[in-house]
Interface confidence: medium
């Protein structure tokens, strides 16, 4: 239970802390465990103990092995271990997983990356940042703090991430890399066979011979990003640049999101200047996504206009 | 109806390009929409791109900016461009349409019969 993991990287700085925890009034010793060699606290040593943290200034592969730090009180006395493995640089570009520190998810709303390890350093911003060993460049990604943003997250972003910084100490600076995997995950996204919210299926619209009219086709496909989400007019079964009417054009309104967070889309059917032979065609409102289509349908009936005579 | 044939797949290596073709003949007055999917050895079948009779498009994350879709009203022919293709991108590639019926689910779009796209140094 009080026995920590630790591992870093040949002429890396490397900072350990102690897994037995206490307040910054008591004292901690550190000992090599194979040898129950006391650890010196004198920075001049290349690896030190400064109080509940062991640091490797910088690191070597001989360094490996198991510590024991004593936290120790009036009252009593608190053992733990440090488990150090000390790894030689890869030539290649892979993490190994004995490198990998724990996999973290991300999606669009909530993209950041934190560098692990970093706060027990004595680091300046800014962290590089690198996925899959190459640096990071461009305007999606951000160094911030001590972590990473990335905006606009896709499936393509999940890989493995490597911050690396310069810690100093006593004015001589040390380097530091740290690599998670980062996976992308849908935030509660989800698809649904097209709901058409508007027109109603079947419905009639009373129109006025002469003037202009608009039909809106209102449909909504799930929550989150959709995939080939689509709403448009037919006329009499035929798509509206087919049907040759120059007066009646469909126009792409805006993409809708309401307050439950649904994606919504509308588009309006504008016919120009009715005609009585309008009122023959059959108008039909699609709404398509992968799940498949639905068609709502409706008919224009002749709005009979008031007569201020009687 | 409306039956789709595919045309263009073929053996290309890693960072190669194709296009693919798909001719739409039969119901095409009433198309809504056509698609472009794959299905790679043990998996399932995937949507790679989209496009609706009005024009707008849709890509799945793993090939945008890689892959083009586009549609030749005039021929009836649906493409898929394909950039930068990786090995991952190795499947049998589907062509699906649906067209202006009442209500139609994913799996009563018309479907293609499928090209192979081999991604292999």
């Known amino acids: 239970k009080f026995s920590k993991q630790s591992w870093g990287l040949e002429n890396e700085a490397l900072i350990v802390r102690c897994p037995r925890q206490g307040k910054p009034s008591y004292t901690v010793d550190w000992y090599y465990s194979q040898t129950n060699k006391s650890i010196p606290t004198q920075e001049r040593n290349r690896v030190f103990a400064s109080g509940q943290l062991l640091k490797f200034l910088p690191a070597a592969v001989a360094d490996s092995g198991i510590y024991t730090c004593i936290v120790r009180s009036p009252t009593f006395n608190r053992t733990g271990y440090a488990n150090v493995t000390i790894y030689k640089k890869q030539s290649d570009c892979n993490v190994p997983d004995y490198l990998m520190y724990s996999t973290v998810s991300g999606s669009e709303k909530n993209s950041k990356i934190y560098c692990p390890t970093i706060d027990l350093y004595n680091w300046t911003a800014p962290l590089e940042w690198f996925k899959n060993c190459q640096a990071l460049q461009g305007s999606r990604y951000r160094a911030h703090k001590s972590f990473l943003v990335i905006d606009n997250v896709m499936t393509e972003d999940a890989g493995d991430y490597t911050c690396k910084f310069i810690h100093n100490e006593n004015g001589a600076n040390y380097s530091v890399t740290a690599t998670r995997s980062f996976t992308v995950k849908d935030e509660q996204g989800f698809s649904l066979f097209p709901v058409i919210g508007a027109p109603a299926q079947n419905e009639i619209k009373e129109v006025e011979i002469g003037k202009n009219a608009n039909l809106t086709c209102s449909a909504c496909f799930g929550k989150g990003t959709q995939f080939l989400a689509a709403v448009l007019w037919q006329l009499n079964g035929t798509k509206i640049t087919d049907f040759g009417e120059p007066r009646i054009q469909q126009e792409e309104g805006q993409n809708q999101s309401f307050s439950n967070g649904l994606a919504c889309l509308d588009m309006v059917l504008r016919i120009a200047d009715v005609k009585e032979e309008d009122l023959l065609l059959q108008y039909d409102c699609l709404a398509l996504n992968l799940h498949g289509l639905r068609r709502h349908t409706v008919r224009l009936s002749r709005k009979n206009p008031i007569d201020h005579h009687s | 109806e409306v039956q789709l044939v595919e045309s263009g797949g073929g053996l290309v290596q890693p960072g190669g390009s194709l296009r693919l073709s798909c001719a739409a003949s039969?119901?095409?007055?009433?198309?809504?929409?056509m698609g472009w999917f794959r299905q790679a050895p043990g998996k399932e079948r995937e949507a790679v791109a989209g496009?609706?009779?009005?024009?707008?498009?849709s890509y799945a994350d793993s090939v945008k900016g890689r892959f083009t879709i586009s549609a030749d009203n005039s021929k009836n022919t649906a493409y898929l461009q394909m950039n930068s293709l990786k090995p991952e991108d190795t499947a049998v590639y589907y062509c699906?349409?649906?067209?202006?019926?009442?209500?139609?689910?994913?799996?009563?779009?018309?479907w293609g019969q499928g090209t192979l796209v081999t991604v292999s140094s």
């Open positions: 496009i609706v009779s009005g024009g707008s498009t």
């Open positions: 699906a349409a649906v067209g202006g019926a009442t209500t139609v689910t994913a799996s009563e779009w018309d």
């Open positions: 039969g119901s095409i007055y009433s198309l809504v929409a």
